[in-house]
């Protein structure tokens, strides 16, 4: 049997289909690029992004990037292909339905990033340790 997500050629174009011929629809993500943010010292924040976009490619997931430096705080919301690095980092949590922020090392700023794959999941960004996915029970909940 043909596994799901097999690439099939239709009119010489590679489109993502399952073995019954249905076409995979891209993710719906908040997509405001970089905006100034008031999100600081909170367990979670809403993006305050009013634009929900259909991602360009079916394999893309939702991404949020929170950055704080001496001058300002910004929140970036986009779609991105998890096979490709974003801001030089791999999107390791792309299969999660929730956008759980993880700190990344960037000189001169505090930098958090999350990725996820459910509708508009980068609208609610979560910093709280309660959601730390090193907890195996939570991993079961997230990936069920």
């Amino acid at each position: 049997t043909i596994p799901p997500h097999v690439q099939k050629s239709v009119n010489n174009d590679m489109i993502v289909t399952d073995n019954n011929g249905a076409v995979k629809f891209p993710q719906l993500c908040k997509f405001c690029d970089v905006r100034f943010s008031t999100c600081d010292n909170q367990k979670s924040c809403m993006s305050n992004c009013s634009i929900t976009s259909i991602c360009e490619k079916p394999q893309e997931v939702c991404v949020a990037v929170w950055r704080k430096n001496d001058e300002n705080i910004t929140l970036e919301t986009v779609c991105h292909d998890p096979k490709l690095p974003y801001h030089d980092f791999i999107l390791e949590d792309a299969a999660s339905p929730k956008c759980i922020m993880k700190e990344k090392k960037k000189p001169g700023e505090t930098f958090f990033m999350c990725s996820c794959s459910s509708d508009e999941c980068n609208d609610n960004i979560i910093f709280s340790e309660e959601y730390n996915t090193s907890n195996p029970d939570l991993l079961l909940v997230i990936f069920q």
């Epitope: 019954n20 249905a22 076409v23």
Partner: nanobody, 124 residues
Framework: EVQLLESGGGLVQPGGSLRLSCAAS????????MAWARRAPGKGLEWVSL????????YYANSVRGRFTISRDNSKNTLYLQMNSLRAEDTAVYYC?????????????????SGQGTLVTVSS
């Protein structure tokens, strides 16, 4: 048998408008999300717009936001795409598509599209 019949395409000048229609049959139209996709010459399939089953929620690709409007008339089993401020890069065959299942939430959306689509050519 599910049938989706697109119409309304044609030749239009840049900056012009067109309204595409999709007549649906063979399924309970008001239970399903519907979408429009397009395939430009030599390019891949691009999803341009999505509408919820009840028509209250609409979504767009960045490439068409602010210019295209998706709508539906559940009493007529018809899906529409109003296209304004058309550009040369909007030239494509446009396809109406139906979600494979009626469920919502954190499930991967899969869509079926059939028929020949309707050709939109934007040229002066």
């Amino acid at each position: 048998e599910v049938q989706l019949l697109e119409s309304g395409g044609g030749l239009v000048q840049p900056g012009g408008s067109l309204r595409l229609s999709c007549a649906a049959s063979g399924f309970t139209f008001f239970n399903y999300e519907m979408a429009w996709a397009r395939r430009a010459p030599g390019k891949g399939l691009e999803w341009v717009s999505l509408i919820s089953a009840d028509g209250t929620r609409t979504y767009y690709a960045n490439s068409v936001r602010g210019r295209f409007t998706i709508s539906r008339d559940n009493s007529k089993n018809t899906l529409y795409l109003q296209m304004n401020s058309l550009r040369a890069e909007d030239t494509a065959v446009y396809y109406c598509a139906k979600r494979r299942d009626a469920s919502m939430g954190h499930t991967t959306r899969r869509f079926d599209y059939s028929g020949q689509g309707t050709l939109v050519t934007v040229s002066s």
